[in-house]
């Protein structure tokens, strides 16, 4: 099936890297600069992706691959291919709207993108706060009071705070 | 593949009550913000109501307040908009649109018509 | 009547540069980024510049934002005529705790 493919249509044999060239009786043309074909085949090359501005280049173009962007420093990628660049925060913030806030009380953030998440809640599990939360870190959790030799003592869990109500900005 | 698809668009009476759904697909949905945008025939867009992560922050367009309500089912992957006291107004193609935390509409569904008429 | 006031069209031809502008309040463009949003006929929006200035992955160059005081602008240069869509300008409003949206300028490439 192949061969018989390939005698009605010569572009079939164009490998990667070129392209089928109807103005030279379709014979197969290397990509010209700046543009590759990742498949064989192809009757056009595609433009390669310049990563300009706030996206800085991860792997070069070539013939056969498109270029790949990340982010420059201070922001990191979104959506598929990095497709978008968005600011990183501190530890203990979140973007928001309008640029990074701290976590509000009862939430942490340990890394510099994403959201501020809800610190474990202990007795869910029985056990007791061993070390407190922070707007950076969960709170460890330790043995449940009951396993505590007597004598011995945890830190008091704090009080399940309501979030007070703020603004997404 | 990164994919947003409503449902429950219809025909509906002045006075009567839908409820949207769009599913998500592609990303972490809990992760992100969520909005409900509508288009009215010929006319521009309108954001109607957005979500928080955890589902403890909404906002909606004036207009709709205390009758519509959005909602998230994070389980689900799945964005919800009940609509009640429908307006011959509230006519128009509803889609829902990831917001980074940034704030930009990166991703859209491809929109449900909503026919509000007696 | 929408919170953001853009012309309700535009219109260039192939190669020309064109701009959008797009008119605020301190409550919105004068706090807030922008974004400019392209539809085309029959499909869903997209995102063309986020941030006042930044452009997806995807956007050709050709499309510029920027921002100054309680106004900002698209701008379109090279004109082609793939670029004639609707255009939307949004930011978020502070007093309205909503976002908004300008009324739209239909782009027309003769």
């Known amino acids: 099936f192949e061969r018989t493919r390939s005698l009605q249509d010569p572009c079939s044999n164009c490998p990667a890297g070129t392209f089928c060239d109807n103005n030279r009786n379709q014979i197969c043309s290397p990509c010209p600069p700046n543009s590759f074909s990742s498949a064989g085949g192809q009757r056009t090359c595609d433009i390669c992706r310049q990563c300009k501005g706030v996206f800085r280049t991860r792997k070069e173009c070539s013939s056969t691959s498109n270029a790949e962007c990340d982010c420059t420093p201070g922001f990191h990628c979104l959506g598929a291919g990095c497709s978008m660049c968005e600011q990183d925060c501190k530890q203990g913030q979140e973007l928001t709207k309008k640029g990074c806030k701290d976590c509000c009380f009862g939430t942490f953030n340990d890394q510099k993108r994403g959201i501020c998440r809800p610190w474990t809640n202990c007795s869910l599990d029985g056990k007791s706060v061993l070390v407190n939360g922070t707007k950076e870190r969960d709170v460890v959790c330790g043995p449940s009071p009951a396993d505590l030799s007597p004598g011995a003592s945890s830190v008091t869990p704090p009080a399940p705070a309501r979030e007070p109500g703020h603004s997404p900005q | 593949e990164v994919q947003l698809l409503e449902s429950g668009g219809g025909l509906v009476q002045p006075g009567g009550s839908l409820r949207l759904s769009c599913a998500a697909s592609?990303?972490?949905?809990?992760?992100?913000?969520m909005s409900w945008v509508r288009q009215a025939p010929g006319k521009g867009l309108e954001w109607v109501a957005n979500i928080k992560q955890d589902g403890s922050e909404k906002y909606s367009v004036d207009s709709v307040k205390g009758r519509f309500t959005i909602s998230r089912d994070n389980s689900k992957n799945t964005l919800y908009l009940q609509m009640n006291s429908l307006r011959a107004e509230d006519t128009a193609v509803y889609y829902c649109a990831r917001e980074t935390n940034g704030g930009a509409f990166d991703i859209w569904g491809q929109g449900t018509l909503v026919t509000v008429s007696s | 009547q929408s919170v953001l006031t853009q012309p309700p069209s535009a219109s260039g031809t192939p190669g020309q540069r064109v701009t959008i502008s797009c008119s605020g309040s301190?409550?919105?463009?004068?706090?807030?980024?922008v974004y400019w949003y392209q539809q085309l006929p029959g499909t869903a929006p997209k995102l063309l510049i986020y941030?006042?200035?930044q452009r997806p992955s995807g956007v050709p160059d050709r499309f510029s934002g920027s921002k100054s005081g309680t106004s900002a602008s698209l701008a379109i240069s090279g004109l082609r005529s793939e670029d004639e869509a609707d255009y939307y300008c949004?930011?978020?409003?502070?007093?309205?705790?909503?976002?908004?949206f300008g009324g739209g300028t239909k782009l027309t490439v003769l």
């Open positions: 941030r006042n200035n």
């Open positions: 949004a930011a978020w409003d502070d007093s309205l705790s909503g976002w908004v």
């Open positions: 592609g990303f972490t949905f809990s992760n992100a913000w």
């Open positions: 301190s409550s919105n463009i004068g706090s807030n980024y």
